[in-house]
Interface confidence: low
């Protein structure tokens, strides 16, 4: 049978050729008739046999980690019969571990990302070296990690690679640490090979800044015409931390005026001092209030970083603006008797400049001929006044600062013209009445009722009468009926168209009025021709009729 | 270079109080925290407590919380130090020094110091 | 008594090295960062190392600090006359909220 033993060969051998081993079968005796043969892949090439002895070389330098083993096949042949001594068999070649390779990190580049105040202890990442050297062959491929640069903020466990925070790191004075990792083969002893990585450790925030003011006071002004809304100026705290945990609010903590209010640009981070209330120079000059700022989002854990919230001082100074004159009254009503003479009081009005100079004032009226005012303010007519041609006026009156004539205010003054009885009651319209010839006694002619253009105090009550001259002689007679009308009739029985065509009556009206006012009204009746039904028949005016309505045969 | 330098020495009676300043010039006064360290005659140095300038955020060590008063003025880069109802064993040179960003990092400058002897 | 423990005096002759050492908790040393000041007689204090082991301009580099968990250490190395100072070890200390200082180690360099 075949004689062997395990054969190895050393990696890497820098010799021609290197003796592997030898191959023989018991049947040979040394004197040279058998012969060996070589066979499979790299035989011939990499390995070569002596056909005489069985001795095998490697004539190649090998590579273990690109090949570790070759199986060939082995015969044996008399050479002087040609005849298969042994039967072919099959053999194993394998390349023996030299420490060759050095650790590498393939899962480069390494990045880790850790919370800034994390405890000693925390795990950061894990760098895993690989080494294409043998495992099992003795401590070539036995890595143990190191920490070239890093400390003392972090750790590598040297089995492992696991690196770990061996000192409390902030993110706000330094984010970002490059950690370089070392790994060594035959754990660390004379001889081993090394390899080298870089992590890149960033620190993500937490919140362990609260805001904190850049001022310990601001000083803000305000124009006392600004309207409320208005924002006056911003005040700005900082924070070391970054994104969320920036995020800031501001409020007011004192304000004793409740004159103020912040609110929080959340995008610039600033707070907004605003108006809540209008101001006023001349009532508060300046104002102090205290504002504070807190994070937006703190996590309960964080809260020692938070107990106080940081304050500021703001001293807010209002800016006097010349403002105009400001009338006691938004508007004034007088009252005045029409018919009283020119140059009569009417009322006075009166304005302030409210800024504290105290501006002398000046008065005018815009477009009235009838009225006056002087710089004190009193309104006067300038002529008599007709309750019946204008029973209001509408003034404006301008209050101008003597100092600065562009500060103008003005109001709308009513001068109500009050009623003198200086009216007596009229006809309400013009009467022209008929009577026939054969009319009898108490007979309705007309109807008439009266007007009086004065305002009435309480209600109108006319009062109607004929003349005196025409009470003692007249055809006609009058009754007031207590409603403001009366009624003409006839006093006698029987009329002449010939004789006496037409009648002027005389009616006195008059008024309640103090003193009673009368006026003569005259009342025309014209006497026309009727037949015994009452038609009229001829009246000496032929239009009166048609315009009576009467037809004429 | 930093330089941080305190008010003169003071005697005061026991029961009244006194007020160190330190004035700070050459950094960003409003950037960095202030500590104020006392050292008694003889014996070693003692923290009392620490004042952010901008905001004037204070934390006082336990021992003299309700006694003790830290106040800043930007205007001025000056921080004050101001400890009540004094008591013999007050007696000290009083330390204001440097801190940093955070409240935990180390102080690199420190005045020259202030003595307070209170006797009656 | 001091929450951060320091022994109150070291000695060593010129030339020798010596280790201060202070030891705290967790709240303290364990979470934060150690500082170490010297006191020259009659001086201010100066900061010596910050951050456990890092030395301000000026400061030689015979003076080093270190820390391991709740306890932290300063040594110094070739000792001169001009090291006779008190040393003290200050933190910030997580549960008082507030800094804490060792009670100081008188260095005596001696001969």
């Known amino acids: 049978g075949w004689v062997w033993n395990q054969f190895f060969v050393p990696e890497e051998m820098n010799t021609t050729s290197h003796h592997v081993g030898r191959l023989r079968s018991d049947l040979d005796n040394g004197n040279n008739s058998f012969q060996y043969k070589l066979l499979g892949a790299g035989a011939g090439s990499t390995f070569i046999i002596d056909e005489r002895t069985g001795d095998i070389y490697a004539i190649e330098k090998l590579d273990r980690e690109e090949r570790s083993l070759y199986i060939l096949r082995a015969q044996v042949i008399d050479i002087t019969t040609g005849r298969a001594v042994e039967p072919e068999s099959e053999f194993v070649i394998k390349v023996s571990d030299i420490n060759d390779n050095e650790p590498k990190f393939l899962d480069e580049p390494y990045e880790a990302i850790v919370p800034e105040m994390s405890p000693e202890g925390t795990l950061v990442i894990q760098v895993t070296a690989s080494d294409a050297d043998d495992p099992s062959s003795g401590n070539n491929a036995r890595l143990l990690y190191s920490l070239l640069q890093g400390q003392p903020y972090f750790s590598v466990e040297p089995t492992t690679g696991v690196i770990r925070i061996s000192s409390k790191m902030d993110r706000e004075l330094q984010d970002e640490y490059w950690v370089i990792i070392q790994a060594k083969d035959m754990i660390g002893q004379p001889g081993a090979l090394s390899g080298t990585t870089s992590v890149l450790i960033k620190l993500s925030d937490v919140n362990d800044n609260k805001p904190i003011f850049k001022e310990s006071l601001y000083r803000l002004t305000v124009s006392e015409s600004a309207p409320t809304g208005t924002s006056i100026g911003t005040i700005m705290a900082y924070d070391n931390d970054i994104g969320e945990n920036a995020e800031m609010d501001y409020s007011i903590e004192e304000d004793d005026s409740q004159t103020f209010d912040i609110i929080t640009n959340h995008e610039t981070q600033e707070g907004i001092v605003i108006l809540k209330k209008k101001v006023n120079f001349e009532h508060q000059n300046h104002y102090g209030i205290r504002a504070k700022v807190k994070n937006h989002h703190v996590d309960e854990q964080l809260m020692k970083y938070h107990t106080e919230a940081s304050t500021t001082f703001i001293k807010i100074q209002v800016e006097d603006v010349d403002e105009p004159p400001l009338f006691l009254l938004p508007y004034y009503i007088f009252e005045i008797f029409e018919e009283t003479p020119q140059g009569s009081f009417v009322g006075v009005v009166s304005a302030t400049d409210p800024d504290n100079r105290k501006s002398p004032i000046r008065y005018s009226i815009t477009r009235s001929k009838v009225f006056n005012i002087d710089d004190n303010g009193t309104i006067t007519t300038t002529n008599s006044l007709d309750r019946e041609i204008s029973a209001w006026y509408n003034l404006s009156i301008t209050a101008t600062e003597k100092y600065n004539i562009e500060q103008i205010s003005s109001i709308p003054v009513y001068v109500q013209v009050l009623n003198i009885n200086d009216h007596a009651p009229e006809f309400s319209q013009y009467y022209e009445s008929y009577v026939c010839e054969n009319a009898g006694s108490g007979q309705v002619i007309q109807t008439i009722s009266a007007v009086d253009r004065d305002e009435s105090i309480e209600e109108h009550h006319f009062y109607f009468n004929l003349s005196v001259e025409d009470t003692n002689s007249s055809s006609f007679t009058i009754i007031d009926n207590q409603d403001n009308t009366a009624v003409i009739l006839t006093n006698r029985t029987g009329f002449n168209l010939q004789e006496e065509p037409i009648f002027y009556i005389s009616i006195l009206i008059a008024d309640n009025g103090i003193p009673s006012l009368t006026s003569t009204n005259t009342l025309t009746i014209h006497v026309c021709d009727c037949d015994d039904s009452g038609s009229t028949q001829t009246c000496q005016y032929q239009e009166l009729m048609l315009s009576m309505g009467f037809k004429t045969e | 270079q930093v330089q941080l330098v305190q008010s003169g020495a003071e005697v005061k009676k026991p029961g009244a109080s006194v007020k160190v300043s330190c004035k700070a010039s050459?950094?960003?006064?409003?950037?960095?925290?202030m500590s104020w360290v006392r050292q008694a005659p003889g014996q070693g140095l003692e923290w009392m407590g620490i004042i952010h300038p901008s905001g004037g955020d204070t934390t006082y060590a336990q021992k003299f919380q309700g006694r003790v008063t830290m106040t800043g003025d930007t205007s001025t880069s000056t921080v004050y130090m101001e400890l009540s109802s004094l008591r013999s064993e007050d007696t000290a040179v009083y330390y204001c020094?440097?801190?940093?960003?955070?409240?935990?990092?180390?102080?690199?400058?420190w005045g020259q110091g202030t003595l307070v002897t209170v006797s009656s | 008594h001091s929450v951060l423990t320091q022994s109150p005096s070291a000695s060593g002759t010129p030339g020798q090295r010596v280790t201060i050492s202070c030891s705290g908790s967790r709240s303290n040393i364990g979470s934060n960062f150690v500082n170490w000041y010297q006191q020259l007689p009659g001086t201010a204090p100066k900061l010596l190392i910050y951050t456990n082991n890092q030395r301000p301009s000026g400061v030689p580099d015979r003076f080093s600090g270190s820390k391991s968990g709740t306890s932290a250490s300063l040594a110094i190395s070739g000792l001169q006359s001009e090291d006779e100072a008190d040393y003290y070890c200050a933190v910030w200390d997580d549960s008082l909220n507030g800094w804490v200082f060792g009670g100081g180690t008188k260095l005596t360099v001696l001969g």
């Open positions: 050459r950094y960003t006064f409003t950037s960095y925290y």
């Open positions: 020094a440097r801190g940093g960003i955070k409240l935990w990092l180390h102080f690199d400058y």
